[in-house]
Interface confidence: medium
């Protein structure tokens, strides 16, 4: 056999050994078929290979595992459980692999797993115990620090007869396993609302991305417990106004940066408090870019340039004078 190509530290199919005699020492770690492996970088890439299951012969040294662009469909319990365990696996990327079901305990026996990316999978069925591994009221803490769940909403016709937001939140909160989570990305999921208890139970969050959803209001969402929060992405939602309670909570977070671009702000009398706050606060990034969407007469006006005289509400007519 020929020597491995020296062009890169990744190898995948070039022979590893110059000869093939019986006296060779055994190779404890093979590279799975259809994957590329770099022991030096502790990385395995099985990318865009139409794999229908997780390879069973993953090398024990793997620290970074990319299984993107495949056709995995289902992640069963113990999908990564091995004997001996994959004790060093710290970063697992499963994005774009056509997963529609992640079962309870799918990520069990990964004691070092810190980063998990399930983005761009149509998760019609995400088990409440996908991340906690058990249905105990208090589970063993998950080692996860980053959980990336961007664009995991399935097509309309594949959703179960239940709230998608509720399904995701149930998985995030089960067994209080994700108390150590620092980054949570939930962008592009058509979320209409954020269940009120979700943030209170993720006290370690530093970064929360809820951009490109359909959030209309944050009225019932409390940020009070998120004392470590550094970035909150709310761009490209359907927010009309932020009310006093929310403004005060955000202002009270010591390290926060909030991103509010591309929301359809309604510049009427209810916007007065938010405009006042925007003029004073340092927490909103790009606040000079925020513009009104409604009413029509206010469209494209910059929020920071408004004054109280601009922010009026049409008087509510008594029923006798209302027209259909």
């Amino acid at each position: 056999s020929s020597p491995t190509s020296s062009a890169s530290s990744f190898s995948s199919s070039a022979p590893f050994l110059a000869s093939a005699v019986s006296a060779q020492p055994p190779l404890p770690d093979q590279c799975p078929a259809l994957c590329e492996c770099s022991e030096a970088a502790r990385t395995v890439k099985c990318v865009n290979r139409n794999l229908t299951e997780v390879p069973t012969d993953l090398p024990a040294y793997v620290r970074n595992l990319f299984l993107t662009g495949n056709q995995l469909a289902v992640l069963p319990a113990g999908a990564f459980a091995r004997r001996p365990p994959l004790a060093e696996l710290a970063a697992l990327n499963l994005s774009g692999s056509r997963l529609d079901e992640v079962r309870a305990g799918a990520f069990e026996h990964l004691p070092s797993l810190r980063q998990l990316d399930l983005s761009h999978n149509p998760l019609a069925d995400l088990s409440p115990f996908a991340f906690s591994g058990s249905n105990a009221s208090v589970s063993a803490p998950s080692p996860l620090v980053e959980l990336i769940l961007n664009h995991i909403v399935p097509p309309e016709d594949e959703r179960q007869n239940r709230s998608f937001e509720g399904m995701v939140v149930a998985a995030l909160l089960a067994g209080r396993a994700l108390q150590g989570l620092r980054r949570l990305e939930l962008a592009s999921n058509h979320f209409l609302y954020l269940p009120r208890d979700v943030l209170a139970q993720l006290p370690s969050l530093r970064h929360l991305d809820l951009s490109n959803n359909s959030l209309v209001s944050l009225t019932y969402v409390s940020f009070r417990n998120l004392t470590h929060l550094e970035s909150l992405h709310l761009e490209d939602n359907a927010l009309k106004v932020l009310h006093n309670g929310t403004l005060a909570e955000l202002q009270g977070l010591p390290h926060i940066r909030v991103f509010l671009d591309n929301n359809p702000w309604v510049c009427d009398c209810h916007m007065a408090d938010m405009v006042t706050w925007l003029k004073e606060t340092e927490v909103v990034q790009g606040k000079d870019r925020l513009t009104c969407a409604y009413p029509e007469k206010m469209r494209n006006r910059v929020l920071l340039e408004l004054n109280s005289a601009d922010l009026d509400c049409d008087p509510i007519l008594p029923p006798s004078l209302q027209t259909s």
């Epitope: 890169s8 199919s13 022979p15 055994p26 259809l34 290979r49």
Partner: antibody
Framework: EVQLVESGGGVVQPGRSLRLSCAAS????????MHWVRQAPGKGLEWVAY????????YYADSVKGRFTISRDNSKNTLYLQMNSLRAEDTAVYFC?????????????WGQGTTVTVSS | DIVMTQTPLSLSVTPGQPASISCRAS??????????MHWYQQKPGQPPQLLIY???NLESGVPDRFSGSGSGTDFTLKISRVEAEDVGVYYC?????????FGGGTKVEIK
Amino acid sequence: EVQLVESGGGVVQPGRSLRLSCAASGFTFSNFGMHWVRQAPGKGLEWVAYISSGSSTFYYADSVKGRFTISRDNSKNTLYLQMNSLRAEDTAVYFCARSPAYYRYGLDYWGQGTTVTVSS
Amino acid sequence: DIVMTQTPLSLSVTPGQPASISCRASQSVSSSTFSYMHWYQQKPGQPPQLLIYSSSNLESGVPDRFSGSGSGTDFTLKISRVEAEDVGVYYCQHSWEIPYTFGGGTKVEIK
């Protein structure tokens, strides 16, 4: 010297079974993934099945899935192909071939082949 | 499945002259690091023999008159100076995904 020697071929009726063997020598068999590839008379090569070094992963061509089973016995340095529900279109020379150690590139060593004829 | 299309079907070459065989995959069989394309020679009555792996790497023991090139979907096997012993059928094969598939083969004859 690396050697792969297939055996077990023969003439068999449609619907019956046959088990092919591939005896390996001259290298550490347990370190290598192994494949079966077949060649129908006068035709090109068709990949049939793959098994990883420790028998933890198997892959099959759609044409044989559910009928053929690949296995290996590392203590005997032998690769097997159990062929059930044989059809006329399974008639071919069957080669075993080795994947290079550690990474999967081309198939670097091949046996001489064993002939399977499915005929009534 | 990835379809491998080889051209020409057959090739008649004068000894000492070059020869070239093309193989086109129905989708890319290259990553940013490697091309998962290999070339085999099969002489009459013999099993195939690996000539080139990963598009351009010469297998040990193979004469250096053989060379391979290409990436993505288009690959080429070249013989710089054909010799009488080079007669046989040449196959390309990818190992990008399951199933591995082979080209239909190119028969090389000597004029």
